[in-house]
Every structure is written in C-alpha cells, then in structure tokens.
C-alpha cells in the first residue's frame, strides 16, 4: 500500500517528499511535479523502489506545485497519491558595503542568508562609460572579496547578486571612487657624459613593482628606448646614448600592472670626447715625441700609428694606457718623414683620429778625430761632425796609466777644434769625444796623443876628478838644443868664470888646468833659438896634489946607500929617482920605479962622495912635487 504522502518546502527552490509503503520490493516509484497552474510541463522522476523520501530541487520560488507518486511492483502501478505544496519566497541579499578603497582596488563586503546561494555574481562597471563591465563570481559561502585592477581616481558602480539554480537575487549596488595613484617624487639627471646619463628619482618605498624608463631622442620619431627596472631601485645608469644629443627621459612606476603618471626630464648628452693639439717633435735622429691633450675622461687606451710617409705598408702600432698624454717613439729611421696618427678608446668608442707629420733628424755623426800641434803641455784636436745637430761636445782626456785625474771639457756644438793645454809632458793620453744633441749622445770616438818631452837637460855628472880638473857630462833630449854653455866658477869667486860653448849634440866636457884642491861650481845651460834653459848646477873640489914625502937615506956603503920614502897610496903610477953628485962631476943617474915600491938600494956610486937625491911621483902623466935629500957614500 502506498500512503502518507507529505510535501514540505526545502528552501525557496525545492520540495521534500515523504511517503510510506509496504516493504514489498517496489521496483521503483514514479514522481510527477507540476506547477499547479500547469504553466509548464510536468517533471517526472523515477526513483528506486527502496526509497521512502526524495528532494525535488530546481523549482520556482513561491510557486504552488502538485506532486503525484505511484509505485511499480511487478509491472503493477499502485494508485496515485497526490499532494499540493508551495515553494518558499526567494531569499534576499542583505546589504553591500565597500570596506576598503585604494587607488587600484577595493574590498567589497555583503550580508546574505547562510547557504542560500551557490555563488555571488559581482559586476564592476566604470560609471559614465560604455566600457564592458568587469564580471566575477565568488563562492556562495563568501561574504567579502577584493576587487583589483581598477583605475585610480575613477567612479565605479559595483553590483552583486546571489545566484542559485539559475535564480539570481535582486542585485544590490554600491558606487565608489578609487583613490588617486600615489605620486612619484622628483626625477633628476645627476651625471651626464657623452654616451650615458644617470637618473635618480624619489618615491614612497615599497609602492611600485617596477619602473619603466623611456629614453627618446628629442625631435625624433625613432623608436624610444625602453627599459624596466625593479621597484626597489632609485637610480639608474642609462648607457648607449649618442653624444651631443638632446633626450627626453620619462619614468613611470607600475603597480600591479598599473602605471603612474610619468615624470619627464630633458637632457643633452655631452659632446664626443676629442683628442686635441697633437704635437710631434723630434727626439734626436731615431725617435719622435708625441704630446696630445685630452679631457680627463677615463680613456681605456690610446692607439698610435707611426708610418713612414713613403712606406704605406710598414706601420708601427702602439697601444698606450689611457692615463698618458705624451710618449716617445724610439727606433725610427734617421732623416725620415713620418705620419703619426692617434685615437683614444673610451668605453669602446674610438675618438676621431688626429694626425701629424714630422721628420726625424739627420743622424748625427762625428768622426776623424785628429791630434795635432803636440807640445810638452798641450795639443790641438780637430774632428768632423754633422752640422746644426750637436748642442755640445764632451771631450775626456785620460792618461793611459790612469795616474792623473780625468779632465772633461764641454764645448759648443758649433766647434770642430779644441786646444787642450795644461798637460804634463811625456805623457800618453787617450782622448774621447762624443757629441750631445737633444736627448741623444753619439757613440764615442777616440784618439791617442803623447805630449812631447820638455827639452830636458838633466843628470849633470862630474867624474874623473883629479887635482887639475874633472869631466862634466849631462843628458839632454835629442835635437832639443842648438848649443850648450858650460860655466866653471871657483867657489870663492876669486877667478874669472870660464865659459865653454859646445854644439847641441855634445854631452861631455873634459876640464883641465884647474887649481888643485879648491872648490868649483859647474853650470850647464842649453840654448834653443837663443833661449837659455835654467842651468843644471854641480859643485866639486879638485883633488889635492898627491905627495911624496919623508925621503930618508940609510945604510951608507962605499958605493951606495939605501933610500926610503912615503907616498899617498894608490895615487902614483910610478916614481922617478934622480941622483947626482953635488959637484956635478959625473952624469946624473935616473931610476924609474914601480908604484908599490917605497925603498931602493942604490949602488955603483963613488966612495966618500956627496950626492943630491930628488924623488917625485908620476900620476896620470903628471909629476908630483919633488922631495930632495943629501947622502954621502962611506969611506972605502
């Protein structure tokens, strides 16, 4: 039996059916739901035979419905049970408020019965525009939502509806004005160079996601140069610009896809860095010196090219540090024209090339160092040298034995001769000559020279001294003297000086006929073209005359006697005895004796006769004073 059909409302859009039935195994139940006024076709539902209740959703609110049910059991349909019931009134949304308003978003709050809606449909529409509304749905359990992506300072109408089973509540609306976008502060250009600039800006911290910088050449339709930088930055270097060019730089902040009003600044980049005043000067014959001016920008380097004007193929390239403003280029050819070019490199940019031409000087040469006019204390130097190059010549005079101090002369580069004086005679010298031109010194050339000996007169020697004279000898330079004058004066100046003139080739004079045993001064002078040297002097004493003395007679016999005497040792060559009777009645007897003898027995005389005896010595052919004695032979 199918009975007790009850219908109750389940909210405003559904009904609940309950029934009882015997516990036979109904195959199923057939339920028909029809608007009471039969406006719409009935809805049929088949539910399992085990059920005793069912919810019928999706109905119209506040609508009377006729609900019928029958069961089917073994193909048999039970009688139909029917009942009438109305759905409830649709629930209304409470109120909607804007809880928070920003410049690009707002927060929407609303009230609504719990569980009444599947979702809420929110529409955001700019007031007074025909732009499409922004629609969004939020789950029916929410009572609040953020609406992002709005425009700043813009009127919006916001509408919300509750939606369930295709039913929407009456919309609730609210009007709101978004706030102004937070302003960015100042945009300034703090550094400007020829190819870059630095931007600085101020803005509240944490406001912006990123900044967009746009760099546009003023008065140009060329595409702007855009760059995006993180919102944490407040400064940015803008590289890659053109020199001497006006630029408009704009900056805007972006927050959640929204851009601020742009800030703009105009700036002109500096002119290209230029090198200026390239000056090339010769550094002697094998080099050039370059000087240039350049702004004190941080040049990475300079590139210099040096090329012989007439030889295009052989260029010399130098890369120099950017701090330099001058350089010497050595190792060039003498007397050669060169083209010199220079450019600077700064941040990869090459400045325009500056060029200049200059010639190296003719290679200075010195040679043919010649020594002439040598005297005992001087000589002349002459040499050849390239004209117009040398500032000075340096002459060094070094004696070969390195006993004397080196003498250095610096003389004008116009000179080709020099007189070197004040040198010692008879000395070997090495002469070194070098030329000095600006920043160069030539190789040194040399010559040797020996100063003449002064016409020396020296070594006055007295030899062979005897009682009656001596020999004078001296030394003198060859061919130095025309004549010599030998002057002999007795020490007491009692006698007239004796002068002897000898030829310039003589070196010796034997003097004879002087007085024995007295002092003499000897002077020897040389004469050259009538000019007298200061004399050499010597003093000498002639020997005393050698003496024979103490002639004694002894041992008289009838025919003779013995004679003895004394004499200076080693002086006499021999002795001569002369014996004659005092009455001169017989021939005199003369006996020559050898030097060592000091006694002699005389025989062969007459008895008792008186004899006169004379004795003298002979020395170098000269006779000494004679000594005498008287002797008488004995009686027979």
């Amino acid at each position: 039996e199918l009975e007790n059909l009850t219908v109750t409302e389940v909210g405003w859009d559904g009904l609940r059916l309950n029934w009882t039935a015997a516990d036979q195994a109904y195959e199923h139940f057939i339920i028909q739901v029809q608007e009471a006024n039969k406006v719409e076709a009935a809805r049929n539902l088949t539910v399992p035979g085990s059920l005793r209740a069912v919810d019928i959703p999706g109905l119209k609110a506040a609508t009377p419905y006729t609900v019928s049910i029958y069961g089917v059991i073994q193909g048999y349909r039970t009688p139909v049970l029917s009942a009438e019931a109305s759905t409830g009134e649709t629930p209304n949304l409470g109120e909607v408020v804007v809880a928070e308003v920003g410049w690009d978003a707002l927060k929407l709050n609303w009230t609504a019965p719990e569980g009444a809606y599947e979702y809420f449909f929110i529409q955001v529409q700019e007031a007074d525009t025909v732009e499409a509304a922004q629609n969004l749905t939020v789950p029916g359990g929410l009572r609040s939502t953020d609406l992002p992506g709005l425009k700043a300072a813009t009127h919006y109408t916001i509408t919300i509806r509750g939606v369930t089973q295709d039913f929407s509540t009456t919309p609730l609306s609210v009007e709101v004005l978004t706030e102004e976008v937070p302003d960015m502060g100042n945009l300034t250009v703090t550094e400007v160079s020829w190819d870059a600039l630095r931007l600085n800006w101020t803005t509240p911290d944490g406001t912006y996601d990123q900044f967009t910088i746009q760099v546009q050449e003023a008065d140009q339709v060329e595409e702007a140069h855009n760059l995006t930088v993180p919102g944490s930055l407040r400064s940015m270097e803008i590289p890659g610009l053109r020199a001497g060019t006006p630029y408009t730089v704009t900056l805007h902040g972006e927050v959640r896809g929204h851009s601020t009003r742009p800030l703009a600044v105009e700036v002109v980049t500096e002119d290209l860095p230029q090198l200026g005043d390239l000056a090339v000067s010769e550094v002697g014959w094998d080099g050039l010196r370059l000087n240039w001016t350049a702004a004190d920008n941080a040049y990475e380097h300079f590139v210099i090219q040096v090329q012989e004007v007439n030889k295009v193929e052989a260029a010399q390239n130098l890369t120099l540090p950017g701090s330099l403003r001058a350089v010497d280029i050595p190792g060039l050819e003498a007397a050669t024209p060169y083209r010199v070019s220079i450019y600077g490199v700064i941040r990869g940019y090459r400045t325009p090339v500056l060029s200049a031409e200059a010639s190296t000087a003719k290679e200075p040469e010195i040679g043919n160092l010649n020594v002439s006019d040598i005297t005992p204390e001087s000589f002349n130097l002459s040499w050849m040298a390239t004209d117009g190059i040398f500032e000075t010549f340096t002459i060094e005079i070094i004696d070969s034995n390195r006993l004397l101090e080196t003498v250095e002369y610096n003389i004008s580069g116009a000179e080709r001769t020099a007189h070197i004086s004040g040198l010692p005679p008879s000395t070997d010298f090495i002469v070194y000559l070098s030329g000095l031109a600006p920043s160069i010194r030539t190789k040194t050339i040399s010559a040797t020279a020996t100063t003449e000996a002064l016409p020396l007169l020296e070594n006055l020697t007295i030899s062979d001294i005897n009682p009656y004279g001596f020999t004078v000898s001296w030394m003198a330079s060859e061919n130095a003297f025309d004549s010599f004058l030998v002057t002999v004066v007795d020490s007491g100046k009692l006698l007239d000086p004796q002068e002897f003139t000898l030829s310039g080739t003589q070196r010796k004079l034997e003097l004879r006929g002087l007085i024995t045993g007295i002092g003499y001064e000897v002077m020897v002078s040389g004469f050259t073209q009538g000019h007298q040297t200061k004399p050499l002097r010597a003093e000498i004493v002639t020997e005393a005359e050698p003496e024979v003395d103490n002639l004694l007679v002894s041992d008289a016999t009838p025919d003779g006697f013995r004679l003895s005497w004394t004499a200076d040792e080693g002086v006499f060559d021999n002795f001569v005895l002369k014996i004659r009777d005092t009455k001169k009645q017989s021939e005199p007897l003369e006996i020559t004796l050898l030097a060592p003898e000091r006694t002699r027995d005389i025989t062969g005389l007459r008895e008792a006769t008186e004899y006169e005896i004379e004795l003298y010595g002979i020395s170098k052919g000269r006779r000494s004073q004679t000594v005498s004695a008287i002797a008488t032979t004995a009686m027979g």
Epitope: D482, S483, L485
Partner: antibody, heavy 118, light 108 residues
Framework: EVQLVESGGGLVQPGGSLRLSCAAS????????MGWVRQAPGKGLEWVSA????????YYADSVKGRFTISRDNSKNTLYLQMNSLRAEDTAVYYC???????????WGQGTLVTVSR | SSELTQDPAVSVALGQTVRITCQGD??????ASWYQQKPGQAPVLVIY???NRPSGIPDRFSGSSSGNTASLTITGAQAEDEADYYC???????????FGGGTKLTVL
C-alpha cells in the same frame, strides 16, 4: 849700427803667394841665426819661422808649416820668407829679427804689412 | 791658445814698482825673455836669460823666475815705460819660440 829692413809685403788674394825679403847690415850676418815674427792687427806677437847660421836647419810654426819657406843668402846678407797658399788669417805685419847663439831676438826690423783679402 | 799666459792689462802709478808675470810649463825649464813694444814700433828686447839686460836698457828693468812663472819688474816706472810687454821663451824643438799674449802697461 845693426839694421834690418823688410820688403815684399802687400795685398794678395787668398790662395796667392808673396816673397818677403830682409836686408841685413851692421853685424856679421853669416854668424847670426835669423827669424820671422808676425803680428796680426791689434793682436800679439807670433813666431813664424827661424833658420840657423848656414841655412841648413829651418824651423816653422805649425800654423805655416808646408806653406811658408824660410831661406837665406849669406853672400847677399839677405833673409827670405816665401809665403804660398795665403789665408786671411796670415794678414799681419811681418818682422825680420836676428839673434846671437845665446840670446833671443835682439834686433828687429820695422816690419812689412801683408794683407790677404779678396 | 798661447802656451805662455799673461795678464791682459796692468797699471802702475808713476814712480811705483810694477810686476808683470808670465806663466807656462816651459818656464820650469827655460828662462823667459821680455820685449817692450810701443805703438807703431818694432819690439825691443829688455830682459833675457836669468836677469840680463841688453845695453841701453835702464836698470829699473829686472827679471826673475820661479817654478812655472817668470816676472818682469819695473822699479820706479816712468811714463815712457807705457807699452805692451811680451814674454817669450822656447817650448823645445817643436815650438822653438813662443810668445805670451802680451800685457798692456799703463803708467798713471
């Protein structure tokens, strides 16, 4: 009285030649050494050349060596100076002088002017 | 350049003594000779050797020598002594006669 009289001076072009003479009297010419000394205008004395008594030995300053020749003729009591390849710097008064063996130049002539110029 | 060096000019008051010097290496060996030359005239020998005067030269002129320096002394200078004075010596066989550069003596 000793007398020395020079002659032969004059104007000559560079590279030219002149011969100076010196006539001697009042002393034994053949027993005296003789010489030439010159004096450029406004300058000092410069010895030029000398010759011994018989003429066998001659002496020259470096500045004239190879260009000047001194000689004498004892029979004529005359001293000579032959000057070749003359230069502007040879312009001077040239004095003839004598000296005995043991005395420098003790008598001088009055000089003769030699001018070397274009 | 001369091997004998003289002062270019020296002056003396009338009647005073003046010394004119000459320096050179050769004077270590040789005596100097001295010549007086007045304008437009030939030189005149006044001193030679150690201290010899030719006849006619007043005895106020004297010579001396020490080391490499020779001196001519005029004791009681007279107006007529105003002249150029040249020292002279030998420098040996290569330079048998050399002259100094000369000293102009002015008698005030």
């Amino acid at each position: 009285e000793v007398q020395l009289v020079e002659s032969g001076g004059g104007l000559v072009q560079p590279g030219g030649s002149l011969r100076l003479s010196c006539a001697a009297s009042g002393f034994t010419f053949s027993g005296s050494r003789m010489g030439w000394v010159r004096q450029a205008p406004g300058k000092g004395l410069e010895w030029v050349s000398a010759i011994n008594e018989e003429g066998g030995q001659t002496y020259y300053a470096d500045s004239v060596k190879g260009r000047f020749t001194i000689s004498r003729d004892n029979s004529k009591n005359t001293l000579y100076l032959q000057m070749n390849s003359l230069r502007a710097e040879d312009t001077a008064v040239y004095y003839c002088a004598k000296h005995p063996p043991h005395r420098p130049f003790d008598y001088w002539g009055q000089g003769t002017l030699v001018t070397v110029s274009r | 350049s001369s091997e004998l060096t003289q002062d270019p000019a020296v002056s003396v008051a009338l009647g005073q003594t003046v010394r004119i010097t000459c320096q050179g290496d050769s004077l270590r060996s040789y005596y100097a000779s001295w010549y007086q030359q007045k304008p437009g005239q030939a030189p005149v020998l006044v001193i030679y050797g150690k201290n010899n005067r030719p006849s006619g030269i007043p005895d106020r002129f004297s010579g001396s020598s020490s080391g490499n320096t020779a001196s001519l002394t005029i004791t009681g200078a007279q107006a007529e002594d105003e002249a150029d004075y040249y020292c002279n010596s030998s420098h040996g066989p290569r330079r048998p006669v050399v002259f100094g550069g000369g000293t102009k003596l002015t008698v005030l």
